[in-house]
Each structure stands twice: as C-alpha cells, then as structure tokens.
Amino acid sequence: EPPTACREKQYLINSQCCSLCQPGQKLVSDCTEFTETECLPCGESEFLDTWNRETHCHQHRHCEPNQGLRVKKEGTAESDTVCTCKEGQHCTSKDCEACAQHRSCSPGFGVKQIATGVSDTICEPCPVGFFSNVSSAFEKCHPWTSCETKDLVVQQAGTNKTDVVCGPQDRLR
C-alpha cells in the first residue's frame, strides 16, 4: 500500500517517499522505484539553507554600499550573506535592509546605550547633579564639578546642560 506520510527529511511524490536534498544542494530529479533523489550543489553566490526539494538555489544577498551596507558574514552554499551597517550607522529593520545614521543625544541628555550595527543610540535626560553640554552619540552625562573639593564655593548653579561655576570663598555674603 502506498504511503500517505513520509519520514523526516523525505517528501511524498508519485505515491513514494523520496529523500530531500540537503542544505547547499538543489533538486535535479525525484527518486523513482529504482533510483535515489538526484541533487546538485548550489553554484557560486547561491545557497539553500534547509533540507529541500527546490529546483533553483537562492541568490546570495548583495550588501549595497550605497545604502550604507557592508558584509558582516560571507554567504556559503548553506547560508545567505549577512549584511550590517557601516561605522556610525545602524540597521533600520531586523533583516538589515537599510541603514540610518546613529542619533546623537542633545545637550541635557547623555548616552545610556551606545549604538551598535543593529540598534540606535539610547539617550536619557541628565538628572540633577549631572550635565551634558554637547550633542554626542558617545558621551554620558558628566557630574557637576564639586567646588568644595577645590576649596571653592558654587557661584552659579548647574543645570542639565551646564556645569556649576565655582568661585573663591571670599565672595561669601
């Protein structure tokens, strides 16, 4: 009696179970009662990443430099090329189809997490006692200067964008 289901890594065709082609190979001809499934390796710049019965291999992805992309991992017969973004940019989607410039944290904000090839800069407001006076994709908030450790007093309060201004003790009123 012809099978209605096949084992793993097999497929049903013409009432019989044939072996699937292994990753990195494509199907040339189905098996018969007398012959095994015929498979051929994928060509250069092609791949198939699963056990399959595909008659054509997929083209390796092209990392388009004009879109800010570069190769992170070269493709093989069994895997696609992995793209990432050039320095100073990050992927805008999970598949890294395009890149965007890392955002900078504005004055009053510091970098909480530096951007990577796959994630943008994360900024956070500088709390009281800290400041950032620059727009930067790398700098954290800086602590206000401690005037007392320099035998000075605060002449002007700090803000989230400016450091305190220290002055001599003799300006006490």
């Epitope: 009281v128 007392e148 605060v154 309060a157 989230n160």
Partner: antibody, heavy 122, light 113 residues
C-alpha cells in the same frame, strides 16, 4: 542638630508683598541649598525653588518666576522668600527645607521648617 | 515637568493591616549612570510639616520604623506599611528629584478605621 525656624502667621492685603524668613542653625548655612515649598489645602505640595546662601545662586520653578524672590544673609544664617503682588491664590503655608546633601545629588528634603501661614484677605 | 501621580487618593485601614500605595511618574526616574531612582517619600501628619521617610526609592531615612518600605523602579513606585499603627494616620507624598522643577504627587491620605 539641623533646625530651620520660620516665623508665625502673616495676614496680608491683596497687592502687598511679604518677606518670609527661615533661620538655620546646626550646620554650615552657606553650603546647602534652602528649598521653598508651598502647600495649599487640596493642592498638595509645590516646589517653588531654591537658594544657595553662599553665593546667592538660585533655581526657580518657572511657575513662580516673578512671584517669588529668594535672598540669603550669611551673617544671620537666614534665608528669605519674598512674595509680591499677593492674591488669594497665594494664601498657603510656606515651608523652607534643606536637602540631606550639599548641592550635587538632587534634593530630597531631610529637614523642614514648621511652616509660615500666609493669608491674603481684603 | 515630570508629573507625579499617586493612588489611591485616600484609603481607610484597620490597625495591624498591611497597606500599599502607588506613585507613578511621567518619565523614568532611574538614571543608568548610577542605577539610582530619584524618588523620595514623605509623611505629613495633621498640623505638622512633612517628614522624610524614604529616599533613592527604597532607602529608609534614619529613625524611620522598618514597617515602612519603599520599592519600585523607573516609573512605578510603591510605599508599603507592613502593619499599620494608629500613629501612621497621615498624608503620604512622593517626590521626584531627577530634574527641575522638583515635583510632588497629590498625596495619599491614610485613615484608620
């Protein structure tokens, strides 16, 4: 120990000004912010601003700019808050307070005065 | 400005009961640079000045009974009184000191049944 002493109640006419003192003892007055807080019934607590007596440096809540003015006299260890052009909205208890740390950590208010009740009435 | 919201606005409990009250901020009060939450809790008994209970969201002020516990991080905070005493009748306020202007919650009034 740290103490902040405030004056008693003040009854003021609309349009007038009032200057509320806060006398500090038990610490180096010039080195710590003096905070000012307003409390109206049903309105909770509102931060008005702060003054650093050593330099006269100030931070104001935008809402109270033009209404409150802070000064400090280091010779008498007294901070002052002047409220101008008084209206019934200014009727409240006004507290002075002092943070635990000096000036660079953000302020939670560890020490409080007993409050000054200001009543504005014609 | 950072908006602080407290709930409930009032609650009545019996002596010995556990009570929790909530404080939420409109932006995170956790600074990654020092992993501290810039939040304090105060108790104000009738006719008195506010009194500091908790700072850095969970550090108990010296002399405050250990039945008072602060917890939470980011934007959600809780003050818990493990076993309420009659003397805990008060209004409880949270305050953020992350950024100017410092702001307080509207308060939670604790009444004793």
């Amino acid at each position: 120990q740290v103490q902040l002493q405030q004056s008693g109640a003040e009854l003021m006419k609309p349009g007038a000004s009032v200057k509320i003192p806060c006398k500090a003892t038990g610490y180096t007055f010039s080195s710590y912010w003096i905070e000012w807080v307003k409390q109206r019934p049903g309105h909770g607590l509102e931060w008005i601003g702060e003054v650093l007596p050593g330099s006269g440096s100030t931070n104001y809540n935008e809402k109270f700019k033009g209404k409150a003015t802070f000064t400090a006299d280091t010779s008498s260890n007294t901070a002052y808050m002047q409220l101008s052009s008084l209206t019934s909205e200014d009727s409240a208890v006004y507290y002075c307070a002092r943070p635990y740390y000096r000036y660079d950590v953000g302020a939670w208010f560890a020490y409080w005065g007993q409050g000054t009740l200001v009543t504005v009435s014609a | 400005d950072i908006v602080m919201s407290q709930s409930p606005s009032s609650l009545a409990v019996s002596v010995g009961e556990k009570v929790t009250m909530s404080c939420k901020s409109s932006q995170s009060l956790l600074y990654s640079g020092n992993q501290k939450n810039y939040l304090a809790w105060y108790q104000q008994k009738p006719g008195q000045s506010p009194k500091l209970l908790i700072y850095w969201a969970s550090t108990r002020e010296s002399g405050v009974p250990d039945r008072f516990t602060g917890s939470g991080s980011g934007t959600d905070f809780t003050l818990t009184i493990s076993s309420v005493k009659a003397e805990d009748l008060a209004v409880y306020y949270c305050q953020q000191y992350y950024s100017y202007p410092y702001t307080f919650g509207g308060g939670t009034k604790l009444e004793i049944k």
